[in-house]
C-alpha cells in the first residue's frame, strides 16, 4: 500500500533504535571515508526529521522518497569533492540516477586501516560510559569496510557484540572472556560479508532471475516438504529483500525481512517442522536463525526425478508452455532431493538440463535425445566431490596454516600477476574452508566447501576488476557465477608469466617480526612464500618446503637469540643465499 510519507512509515515499522542503526549503516556504506561523528550528526538530523513526519505526514518534504532525502543529506556534506573526488559528480544527477551513481562508487577494498579491537579494559570502560555510541562506532566501522554488508544482519551482530560486552565486562578476567567470543562473532560476520557480497554480485551482474534461481535451490534444500508454490513465494520475497539491501534501500530491506520472518513463522505447517525454536526468538535473532535453520527431514516417498523430467513424453511441451516455471520445478525437485549438493552445483545441473532441452526439443525425436541427460550429470557431480575429498585430505594432513600455504602456492602459480597482498588474503580465506567445512559430516561437506569457495572467489574477482592484471583471472571472472569455482580449479601454471627477478630486500627480515601476533607472523611468511613462487613459478613443492622450513628455523633461532638484531643482520643474508641456491 502507498504511504503519504515513506520515512514516517519506515520509522514506525522499524522503531527508533533500528531506524537509526540502519540509517547509520546506509551512510557509512555510501561515504566510507567520513568519520563516525560526521555520520552520527547526519543520522540524528534524519531521525529528527522522521519524527516530524510521524507527527504530521503532510509536513514539508515528508512525501519525498528515501533516496531523495538521503541523497540530499549526503550531497550537503562539506568538502565532498576534496574527500571523495568524482563521487561528488553523483550530486549533479537526479534520482534514481543519483543513487545508482552512489552505488557504483562503493569501494570493496577501501584504504582504511584494519579494524583494531581495543584492549579489554578500555573497551569495557567506553562501553559502560555510552553503550549506544559504542555500538554506533561498531556499525560505522564494519559498514564502511564492508559496503554491501547485509544491514539487518549487521544489526544482529551488533546485538551479539552488545550481549558479549554486557556479560564479559562484569567478569574479573575480561580479556579471556571477551577474546574468544568476539573472535567468534568476527569470524561469522566476515563470512556473512563475503556471502552477501556474492548475492549482490549475482543481482548486479545477472539480475533478479539469477538470484531467484539461487534462492529456489537453497530454500528447496532447507524446506523439502514445502510445495513448489510455497518455495516460489519465499524465493520471490527473499529476492525482493536482497535486491533492496544490495541497492542501498536498507530501511525497506529490513522491514521486508521482518515481514518475511513473520510470514514464515505464521506458516510453519506448510514450510518446515524445524522453525519453532527460531520463531520463539526476538526479531533480529529470529531472522538470523531462520536464515541458517537446519534442513527439514526429506519426505520418504519422493518419486525418482526421471519420471517427470526425462521419461515423460510431455517434457518439451511442458517446457515450451512455461520455460521458467518448468525449469524452476526441475530445480526445486532436484534440490529438495539433494541437501548434500552445493547450490552452485544444483544451478550447474539446472543449466545443463536447460541446455539439453534447448538442443533436444528442437530435434525430431526429443525423448531419444534427452533420455540420457541424468547420466550426463555424473561428471558435473563428480568434479566437486573430488575437489572436496582432495582438499579435505590435504587439510587433515597439513592443518590450516599448511593448507593455506599449499593454496597460496597453487593460486600464485595460476595468477602470478595478481598482487601479493591479494593472493595472501585470498589463500588465507580459501584455506579456512578446511577448518570450516572438512570437520562436518560427509553429507554437509560439499555444500559447505563449494558455496564458501565461490563466495571467496567472488571477492577475488571484485578486487581484480579494479585493476585487471591476469588473463586467467579475467577469463574465470567474466563467466557465470556458478562456473567460476570450477574455472579457477581448472587453471594451471600461467605459462605466459615472466618470472620476477630475485630481490634480496623482499626476503630481508628484522627483529620486529618477533613481537608480532601469530597471525601477522603468518602473513609475513606467506608474503615471502608468494614472492618465492613469483620468482620461481615452477619450483617444486619439495624445493618450496625446504626454503620455508629453513625460513621458519631462521625466525625461530633469531627470535630466541639474546641479540636479535645482530642475529637477523648476520643470518639473514645467509638465508637469502641458501634460498637462491635451493631454487636454482
Amino acid at each position: 500500500e502507498a504511504h503519504k510519507s515513506e520515512i514516517a512509515h519506515r520509522y514506525n515499522d522499524l522503531g527508533e533504535q533500528h531506524f537509526k542503526g540502519l540509517v547509520l549503516i546506509a551512510f557509512s556504506q555510501y561515504l566510507q571515508k567520513c568519520s563516525y561523528d560526521e555520520h552520527a550528526k547526519l543520522v540524528q538530523e534524519v531521525t529528527d526529521f522522521a519524527k516530524t513526519c510521524v507527527a504530521d505526514e503532510s509536513a514539508a518534504n515528508c512525501d519525498k522518497s528515501l533516496h531523495t532525502l538521503f541523497g540530499d543529506k549526503l550531497c550537503a556534506i562539506p568538502n565532498l569533492r576534496e574527500n571523495y573526488g568524482e563521487l561528488a559528480d553523483c550530486c549533479t544527477k537526479q534520482e534514481p540516477e543519483r543513487n545508482e551513481c552512489f552505488l557504483q562508487h562503493k569501494d570493496d577494498n577501501p584504504s582504511l586501516p584494519p579494524f583494531e579491537r581495543p584492549e579489554a579494559e578500555a573497551m569495557c570502560t567506553s562501553f559502560k560510559e555510552n553503550p549506544t555510541t559504542f555500538m554506533g562506532h561498531y556499525l560505522h566501522e564494519v559498514a564502511r569496510r564492508h559496503p554491501y554488508f547485509y544491514a539487518p544482519e549487521l544489526l544482529y551482530y551488533a546485538e551479539q557484540y552488545n550481549e558479549i560486552l554486557t556479560q564479559c565486562c562484569a567478569e574479573a578476567d575480561k580479556e579471556s572472556c571477551l577474546t574468544p567470543k568476539l573472535d567468534g562473532v568476527k569470524e561469522k560476520a566476515l563470512v556473512s560479508s563475503v556471502r552477501q557480497r556474492m548475492k549482490c554480485s549475482s543481482m548486479q551482474k545477472f539480475g533478479e532471475r539469477a538470484f531467484k534461481a539461487w534462492a529456489v535451490a537453497r530454500l528447496s534444500q532447507t524446506f523439502p516438504n514445502a510445495d513448489f508454490a510455497e518455495i516460489t513465494k519465499l524465493a520471490t520475497d527473499l529476492t525482493k529483500v536482497n535486491k533492496e539491501c544490495c541497492h542501498g534501500d536498507l530501511l525497506e530491506c529490513a522491514d521486508d525481512r521482518a515481514e518475511l520472518a513473520k510470514y514464515m513463522c505464521e506458516n510453519q505447517a506448510t514450510i518446515s517442522s524445524k522453525l519453532q525454536t527460531c520463531c520463539d526468538k526476538p526479531l533480529l535473532k529470529k531472522a538470523h536463525c531462520l536464515s541458517e535453520v537446519e534442513h527439514d527431514t526429506m519426505p520418504a516417498d519422493l518419486p525418482a526425478i526421471a519420471a517427470d523430467f526425462v521419461e515423460d513424453q510431455e517434457v518439451c511441451k511442458n517446457y515450451a508452455e512455461a520455460k521458467d516455471v518448468f525449469l524452476g520445478t526441475f530445480l526445486y525437485e532436484y534440490s529438495r532431493r539433494h541437501p548434500d549438493y552445493s547450490v552452485s552445483l544444483l544451478l550447474r545441473l539446472a543449466k545443463k538440463y536447460e541446455a539439453t532441452l534447448e538442443k533436444c526439443c528442437a530435434e525430431a525425436n526429443p525423448p531419444a535425445c534427452y533420455g540420457t541427460v541424468l547420466a550426463e550429470f555424473q561428471p558435473l557431480v563428480e568434479e566437486p566431490k573430488n575437489l572436496v575429498k582432495t582438499n579435505c585430505d590435504l587439510y587433515e594432513k597439513l592443518g590450516e596454516y599448511g593448507f593455506q600455504n599449499a593454496i597460496l602456492v597453487r593460486y600464485t602459480q595460476k595468477a602470478p600477476q595478481v598482487s601479493t597482498p591479494t593472493l595472501v588474503e585470498a589463500a588465507r580465506n580459501l584455506g579456512r574452508v578446511g577448518t570450516k567445512c572438512c570437520t562436518l559430516p560427509e553429507d554437509q561437506r560439499l555444500p559447505c566447501v563449494e558455496d564458501y569457495l565461490s563466495a571467496i572467489l567472488n571477492r577475488v574477482c571484485l578486487l581484480h576488476e579494479k585493476t585487471p592484471v591476469s588473463e586467467h583471472v579475467t577469463k574465470c571472472c567474466s563467466g557465470s557465477l556458478v562456473e567460476r569455482r570450477p574455472c579457477f580449479s581448472a587453471l594451471t601454471v600461467d605459462e605466459t608469466y615472466v618470472p620476477k627477478e630475485f630481490k634480496a630486500e623482499t626476503f630481508t627480515f628484522h627483529s620486529d617480526i618477533c613481537t608480532l601476533p601469530e597471525k601477522e607472523k603468518q602473513i609475513k611468511k606467506q608474503t615471502a612464500l608468494a614472492e618465492l613462487v613469483k620468482h620461481k613459478p615452477k619450483a617444486t613443492a619439495e624445493q618450496l618446503k625446504t626454503v620455508m622450513d629453513d625460513f621458519a628455523q631462521f625466525l625461530d633461532t633469531c627470535c630466541k637469540a639474546a641479540d636479535k638484531d645482530t642475529c637477523f643482520s648476520t643470518e639473514g643474508p645467509n638465508l637469502v643465499t641458501r634460498c637462491k641456491d635451493a631454487l636454482a
Epitope: Q313, E314, V315, C316, K317, Y319, A320, E321, E358, C361, A362, E363, A364, N365, P366, P367
Partner: nanobody
Amino acid sequence: KVQLVESGGGLVQPGGSLRLSCAASGFTFSSFGMTWVRQAPGKGLEWVSSISGSGSDTLYADSVRGRFTISRDNSKNTLYLQMNSLRAEDTAVYYCTIGGSLSPSSQGTLVTVSS
C-alpha cells in the same frame, strides 16, 4: 499462452489428398520439434510423424511412410502434413503437438476417408 490450431481436415475419397496445417503461437516455434498424432474413432492415440525445429530431420510411422510428408514454415509459425494416397484407415482426428508429446492439448482436425 501456447496455442496450437489445426485446420485443413475434411471428407476425402480413398486415394485422395489433403494438406493439414497447424498454426502455433505463444512460444518460439523454430526452437521446437513438432509432431502429428492421430486418434481413430474408438482407438488410442497414434504417433504419425515428427520434424525438427529447423525442418532438416523428419520421422514417420511405418503406416504412413511414403504417403505423408511433414514440413514447416518457421517464418509463418506453421506446421504442415501433406497426406497423399489416403486410405480408410487414415480416418481420425489429427492433432499437432510440441516435441515428442503424445497427448494433445488442442481441438484437432477431423479427416474422414470414405467413398
